[in-house]
């Protein structure tokens, strides 16, 4: 029962992580203009994302421009885009694997196979979390490096945008949810005691018969 509860918690966390990841990837708030010192040239905020950049005027008016050419984009941006999309697809695949092995589904009947599928889904979610973490940390590293580089102009410096925080949250939720799903399925956790005997007892025979194979006529 506790195992089922952990499974549900794990999958809820991963779903929240996936939604966070999707929002993080989509929002143009990876890099935000940093106004440092007393040199504000214009009262506007620039947001930069993976797919577009937006300029927010002091009046509140916002203009967004989708990046034109894929080939003209910096390689790190292309890589971040790819990793974001891959991470989301991997998490979706993890969800499908989980659904196939969930306790409340009938896709797979055998408990052993169900446990393996849940474990696999947990691993897939963990992979998705790591994939989400890479572009977020890479972008954060670049922003911080620029911030402390004395030769980078103040106007070129950026701050960590909301998308990065969402990305970290998404990664954390995917890692945590995936980890929980892995923990709900220790080897043999969903199996009967006879399996434990066969696996861990040195005196157990090489081939142990299931209870249905023993003759019952001699038993009262």
């Amino acid at each position: 029962m506790a195992s089922a509860g952990m499974q549900i918690l794990g999958v809820v966390l991963t779903l929240l992580g996936w939604v966070n990841g999707l929002v993080s990837c989509a929002l143009p708030m990876w890099k935000v203009t940093a106004f440092i010192g007393n040199s504000i040239v214009v009262a506007q905020v620039v947001w930069e994302g993976l797919w577009m950049s937006c300029v927010v005027q002091s009046t509140g008016q916002m203009q967004c421009k989708v990046y034109d050419s894929l080939l003209a984009l910096p390689q790190d941006l292309q890589a971040a885009r790819a990793l974001c999309v891959i991470a989301l697809l991997v998490a979706l695949f993890g969800l499908l694997v989980y659904l196939a092995g969930a306790k409340c589904t009938t896709c797979v009947e055998e408990k052993d196979s169900k446990a393996r599928l849940v474990l696999t889904s947990g691993i897939v979610f963990v992979i998705s979390g790591v994939l989400t973490l890479i572009p977020v940390c890479w972008t954060a590293h670049a922003i911080i490096r620029d911030f402390y580089n004395p030769l980078v102009a103040e106007a070129q410096k950026r701050e960590l945008g909301a998308s990065l925080y969402l990305g970290w949250a998404a990664s954390g939720l995917l890692l945590l949810g995936g980890g929980l799903l892995c923990c709900t399925c220790p080897s043999g956790g969903s199996q009967g005691p006879s399996h434990y005997m066969a696996r861990y007892s040195t005196s157990a025979p090489a081939i142990s018969r299931g209870p249905s194979e023993y003759p019952t006529k001699n038993y009262v």
Partner: antibody, heavy 119, light 107 residues
């Protein structure tokens, strides 16, 4: 108009010391990163040192670390470069440079002051 | 340290021609590259920063480009006032280093 005037250059013996000054005008001195870059007789450019707008952070290449010290007096709008243990390879034209709010790199250069290290 | 290899060391071209100066970084520097122009007897001047962005007041015949660790400064329709030494410089990490320079002359 941004104006950077270097002074203090001259002839010095190896192992000697020299202090360069850069008088800045035409801008808010305490808002900008300042640097020194030198140009050797062979016309090669070499970054020497950079100091943050407030003076709290300084950046040196290994070639001058421990021998050169950059400082600034924001009240006097002046940048300094204290050079000690001078070597013949330090012979160069030394330029005082101001950073910019919009542009990366070394945006505004002074006219330079010549330092000759020779016996 | 990151080495900047600039080529050619010198070049001669006619007015109206297009010339290209290249600079190769010994390792990745992203787009942290600037180009400077130094006319005879003058101090260097910043032309291009972030590998492709032109400083205000620099004629549009100048353009910068990047391909991996190779950077180029292109001068379209060369003018007599473009006679100068050109330097590339990276500012990716300390120490910041310059290319050896290219001396551009008019035929």
């Amino acid at each position: 108009e941004v104006k950077l005037v270097e002074s203090g250059g001259g002839l010095v013996k190896p192992g000697g010391s020299l202090k360069l000054s850069c008088a800045a005008s035409g801008f808010t001195f305490n808002s900008y990163t300042m640097s020194w870059v030198r140009q050797t007789p062979a016309k090669r450019l070499e970054w020497v040192v950079t100091i943050s707008s407030g003076g709290g952070r300084t950046y040196y290449p290994d070639s001058v670390k421990g021998r050169f010290t950059i400082s600034r007096d924001n009240a006097r709008n002046t940048l300094y470069l204290q050079m000690s243990s001078l070597r013949s390879e330090d012979t160069a034209m030394y330029y005082c440079i101001r950073g910019d709010y919009r542009y990366d790199g070394f945006a505004y250069w002074g006219q330079g002051t010549l330092v000759t290290v020779s016996t | 340290d990151i080495q900047m290899t600039q080529s050619p060391a010198s070049l001669s071209a006619s007015v109206g021609e297009t010339v290209t100066i290249t600079c190769r970084a010994s390792e990745n520097i992203d787009s942290y590259l600037a180009w400077y122009q130094q006319k005879q007897g003058k101090s260097p001047q910043l032309l291009v920063y972030a590998s492709t962005l032109l400083v205000d007041g620099v004629p549009s015949r100048f353009s910068g480009s990047r391909s991996g660790t190779q950077f180029s400064l292109k001068i379209n329709s060369l003018q007599s006032e473009d006679v100068a030494r050109y330097y590339c410089q990276h500012y990716y990490s300390i120490p910041y280093t310059f290319g050896s320079g290219t001396k551009l002359e008019i035929k």
